[in-house]
């Protein structure tokens, strides 16, 4: 998303005008942040605290189990992606506080926001991979019995990370530092300059591969899984439905503003009022998308079977039960079964 719509710490919200009147200074300074930026800062702060602590805990719990439990491999990769994304938040936070001034230099401008994107897309694509895994568990149990192993799970994760890297390359290549003459400020953003077609292509590819395709995968997989599990009286439950709806809805809700504004801006002239309005909302859209980075640990805890009873346990042991459990498969973006004793269990208890 283009980021060249920001004001400066020195001159605040500079309001330009088209008349030369020496008696009326054009410099209308204000060091107050815009409302969308304040909201973004609040969200960033909450996401950082919950995301770093929650994902660190998940990494700690799953790291020991990742060699033998496929569940743990999924959770570990998701948590690493989210954790790394959260670590970059203080930089975004600092930039917004300084009215989007970028004091970190050109190399940081290319690398840091690109790392954020890399990890965000890795999270999305891993969710799609997990949902595909669940689909296979339900509909191809014999294939899973024969081929579903830790090695394949790691390969699937590597593919997800690789695709995330590919999605991030355009952002990395076109990301530049621009120093504006007045008001004096340094901005970090994506600049396609002459190539509006390429900007649109990047936005469309990002929308399809980073949003629509995973969303479609999740929706289809969970719809089929629901239909199969609901057809068996023993596994029919409202909790399953709630978790599945939470998975798809949270993904859709939190990424939608970022993707919609991104695609709209790629088709608008940078000087148009709509573009400028959307660009003012950019930080808020990014922060909204960032909620995905802290929502996983929350879902892991809330969706744990017998949650009420487990509250008395310590958080690590609660997470261990949820994340490395092998006897029951749960319906969320975070719950996938790795091994079960019998194929009957595999198809009945998903």
């Amino acid at each position: 998303m283009n980021s060249f719509n920001y004001t400066t710490p020195d001159y605040g919200h500079y309001d330009d005008k088209d008349t030369l009147d020496l008696n009326t200074p054009v410099d209308k300074t204000s060091n107050t942040l815009r409302v969308p930026d304040i909201l973004a800062l609040v969200i960033f702060a909450v996401v950082f605290l919950v995301g770093v602590l929650g994902n660190a805990l998940v990494v700690w719990v799953t790291a020991f189990e990742a060699k033998r439990t496929i569940n743990a491999i999924w959770f570990l990769n998701l948590a690493v992606a989210d954790f790394l994304s959260c670590l970059a938040l203080p930089i975004l936070f600092t930039s917004i506080v300084q009215h989007h001034h970028w004091p970190f230099g050109g190399a940081a401008c290319s690398i840091l926001p690109s790392l954020i994107l890399l990890n965000m897309y890795a999270s999305i694509l891993l969710l799609a991979t997990i949902s595909a895994d669940r689909f296979l568990l339900v509909f191809k149990p014999i294939w899973c019995q024969n081929f579903r192993g830790a090695g394949l799970a790691w390969i699937a994760c590597a593919v997800a990370w690789g695709l995330a890297l590919l999605l991030t390359i355009p952002s990395f290549l076109y990301r530049v530092v621009r120093e504006e003459y007045f008001p004096p400020k340094v901005l970090c953003g994506v600049d396609y300059s002459h190539d509006k077609r390429r900007e649109r292509a990047v936005a469309i590819v990002r929308l399809v591969l980073g949003f629509l395709w995973p969303l479609l995968t999740l929706t289809i997989c969970y719809t089929f899984i629901l239909l199969r599990t609901w057809s068996r009286r023993a596994t029919r439950s409202t909790k399953t439905l709630k978790v599945v709806v939470a998975v798809v809805a949270s993904f859709f809700i939190f990424w939608l503003p970022y993707q919609v504004t991104g695609i709209m801006m790629s088709f608008l002239e940078p000087s148009s009022p709509t573009f400028l309005l959307l660009n003012k909302l950019d930080s808020l859209c990014v922060s909204f998308a960032y909620i995905n980075c802290c929502i996983n640990p929350i879902i892991y805890v809330v969706a744990g079977q017998g949650f009420q009873g487990r509250l008395r346990k310590s958080l690590p042991s609660l997470l261990r039960n949820v994340l490395t459990e092998e006897s029951v498969v749960r319906e969320s973006k975070s719950f996938t079964r790795s091994t079960v004793d019998t194929m009957a269990q595999k198809t009945q208890a998903v």
Partner: antibody
């Protein structure tokens, strides 16, 4: 009426320093930026730097190590100092202002100071 | 730095005819506030440059309406609808969106 008047030496020896003064009238330096631009013989214009109303300065990175811009608000004067002059610093030096942070481009210009760097 | 490329280098024109000068920037000149800080100057022999057009199309006070500016993003044009003798000189385009502000190489308008 807005005016910018320049004063400074016409001939400077290589490796010496150049100092030019720009005295403004018709506006206050406390809320207006003043830029310095030079034009080598038969060539285009080159921006050297700016001093904003709040005293913040910005220089052309290619010349940053040799340039210094300062001002005296009470005297309505802006000063340009160029150190370690070389023969290719021979140019017409202008002070200019956009006024009122308007960024309309350089609306008002000084008459220029022709500086020749020669032994 | 933003490179400003002006064409043509020299423009012979008959008095009363239209003249058109093109200016292209190496980067987008759209400022983060939505404005485009592309300006046009005229420099007559032995004089300081004079601002004609600011922010792409706005005429500076006192500039005749035969001067007009247009363009967006990276491509800009200055048009003089009916060239008069007093219009002769070197025309420069310049940007003050990014640091450092940069100028085009100049276009010399001369009588054919």
């Amino acid at each position: 009426q807005v005016q910018l008047k320049q004063s400074g030496p016409g001939l400077v020896a290589p490796s010496q320093s150049l100092s030019i003064t720009c005295t403004v009238s018709g506006f206050s330096l406390t809320n207006c930026g003043v830029d310095w631009v030079r034009q080598s013989p038969g060539k285009s214009l080159e921006w050297l730097g700016v001093i904003w109303g709040d005293g913040l300065t910005k220089y052309n990175s290619a010349l940053k190590s040799r340039l210094s811009i300062s001002k005296d608000n009470s005297k309505s004067q802006v000063f340009l100092k160029v150190n370690r002059l070389q023969t290719d610093d021979t140019a017409m030096y202008y002070c200019a202002s956009a006024l009122d942070y308007s960024n309309f481009g350089f609306a008002y210009w000084g008459q220029g100071t022709l500086v020749t760097v020669s032994a | 730095d933003v490179v400003m490329t002006q064409t043509p280098l020299s423009l012979p024109v008959s008095l009363g005819n239209q003249a058109s000068i093109s200016c292209r920037s190496s980067q987008s000149l759209v400022h983060s506030n939505g404005n485009t800080y592309l300006h046009w100057y005229l420099q007559k022999p032995g004089q300081s440059p004079r601002l004609l057009i600011y922010k792409v199309f706005n005429r500076f006070p006192g500039v005749p309406d035969r001067f007009s500016g247009s363009g967006s993003g990276t491509d800009f044009t200055l048009k003089i609808s009916r060239v008069e003798a007093e219009d002769l000189g070197v025309y420069f385009c310049a940007q003050s969106t990014l640091v450092p502000p940069t100028f085009g190489g100049g276009t010399k308008l001369e009588i054919k």
